[in-house]
């Protein structure tokens, strides 16, 4: 049994780190493998993660963690029974992938504005809470040529779009993702998309 692609891990900087790797051949990850991890810290114990399959040769493990701080460093050992397949380390603060924003809602009853709101995925006491900026993707299923990214570089999880900039009488979809500038993170996954119908019509005298 051989590791083809070494484990690569990312942290949500809250409670979970996700490690993915590829094996040399088809593997029943949960039956054959264990990923052991231990915080390098006084009197810390070794903890075990049972991986799941992620495609034929891929495995994924979700490591439960306490709060993350910048000093944290974990040792990782991938075992197949009594055989040590791989040994490495992981510093969560240097490999952060934020959680996806949630509760994306579209408000179309605000005069001539489409208002999008969503929730910050972190509690206020988390370091990432005040560091997230967002990208909102808006596209139309009726108009495949229309797709826009709106960068939200302020802290408030809202975006206002003049309804007049969207075509009337067609449906739109929106989704949002996040990243944290000062932690040099990757982008989060996209939130689930939400759909709305743009019924806005310009006043008669402006047509």
């Amino acid at each position: 049994m051989k590791v083809l692609q070494e484990p690569a891990c990312v942290s949500d900087y809250m409670s979970i780190s996700t490690c993915e790797w590829k094996m040399g051949g088809p593997t029943n990850c949960s039956a054959e493998l264990r990923l052991l991890y231990q915080l390098v810290f006084q009197s810390s114990e070794t903890h075990t993660c049972v991986p799941e399959n992620n495609g034929g040769v891929g495995c994924v493990c979700h490591l439960l963690m306490d709060d993350v701080v910048s000093m944290d460093n974990y040792t990782l050992d991938l075992w197949a029974g009594q055989q040590l397949l791989w040994k490495g380390s992981f510093k969560p603060s240097e490999h952060v992938k934020p959680r996806a924003p949630g509760n994306l809602t579209v408000h179309t009853n605000v005069s001539d504005t489409v208002l999008l709101t969503w929730s910050n995925p972190y509690p206020p006491d988390n370091y990432l809470y005040n560091d997230l900026t967002y990208a909102v993707n808006i596209w139309s299923e009726n108009d495949p040529a229309y797709s826009r990214i709106h960068n939200v570089t302020y802290l408030k999880p809202t975006l206002r779009i003049p309804a007049s900039t969207l075509k009337s009488g067609i449906s739109y979809r929106a989704r949002v993702r996040a990243w944290a500038q000062h932690y040099n993170t990757t982008w989060s996954e996209w939130s689930p998309s939400t759909k709305w119908y743009n019924s806005y019509r310009e006043p008669f005298e402006q047509r």
């Epitope: 006084q42 009197s43 963690m65 000093m71």
Partner: antibody, heavy 125, light 112 residues
Framework: EVQLVESGGGLEQPGGSLRLSCAGS????????MTWVRQAPGKGLEWVSS????????YYADSVKGRFTISRDNSKNTLYLQMNSLRAEDTAVYYC??????????????????WGQGTTVTVSS | DIVMTQSPLSLPVTPGEPASISCRSS???????????VDWYLQKSGQSPQLLIY???KRASGVPDRFSGSGSGTDFTLKISRVEAEDVGFYYC?????????FGQGTKLEIK
């Protein structure tokens, strides 16, 4: 009531052996790391050894490494310190203390918040 | 190993007056925001040590509020706002960030 009670101290000749015990009660013993601290007559406190809740992680002061062995029996809620090749400078009162919660991913620390009454070890010919 | 240096080594105090003990570590004991791994212990004559302060500034259960801990990184202070006769004994700081745990030399607090 959370309590630690040491026993096993006594008078021993240089080169001899003693085994100290520390019985814990009133808390979930296996969840906590445990520590031994000693105090030579008229001197300050000196850390001796620590052990994690599972017993998998063990730490020693350089002054006792290779001579002392810390262990625990979680089924008996008891901590041990096996002392071999005793020297005159090991003469001290030995205390056991309740250390951090070690079962969490990051051990939770609340200080060495419970201490035993101490047991006296005298090494002399 | 981390070295813990305490001062003063002797502290005569008048009852009702404040007292302050300093402890300096040879390397930072700050692990994360607000968590400095330094403790303060009091050992009264003929007794086992007792925990006063942990993680730099957190008062242990049952410890009177006249005791307080402060400082960060390498410099720490134990303050007693109004010394009482029962506070006499030896005070020790200890670094608990990593083994070997190291105690300061101890400060003998006595009543004038």
């Amino acid at each position: 009531e959370v309590q630690l009670v040491e026993s096993g101290g006594g008078l021993e000749q240089p080169g001899g052996s003693l085994r100290l015990s520390c019985a814990g009660s009133g808390f979930t013993f296996r969840d906590f790391a445990m520590t031994w601290v000693r105090q030579a007559p008229g001197k300050g406190l000196e850390w001796v050894s620590s052990i994690s809740g599972s017993g998998d992680n063990i730490y020693y002061a350089d002054s006792v490494k290779g001579r002392f062995t810390i262990s625990r029996d979680n089924s008996k809620n008891t901590l041990y310190l096996q002392m071999n090749s005793l020297r005159a400078e090991d003469t001290a009162v030995y205390y056991c203390a309740k250390d951090r919660v070690s079962i969490t991913i990051r051990p939770r620390y609340y200080g060495l918040d419970v201490w035993g009454q101490g047991t006296t070890v005298t090494v002399s010919s | 190993d981390i070295v813990m240096t305490q001062s003063p080594l002797s502290l005569p105090v008048t009852p009702g007056e404040p007292a302050s003990i300093s402890c300096r570590s040879s390397q930072s004991l700050l692990y994360s925001i607000g968590k400095n791994y330094v403790d303060w212990y009091l050992q009264k004559s003929g007794q086992s040590p007792q925990l006063l302060i942990y993680l730099g500034n957190k008062r242990a259960s049952g410890v009177p509020d006249r005791f307080s801990g402060s400082g960060s990184g390498t410099d720490f202070t134990l303050k007693i706002s109004r010394v009482e006769a029962e506070d006499v004994g030896f005070y020790y700081c200890m670094q608990s960030l990593q083994t070997p745990y190291v105690f300061g030399q101890g400060t003998k607090l006595e009543i004038k």
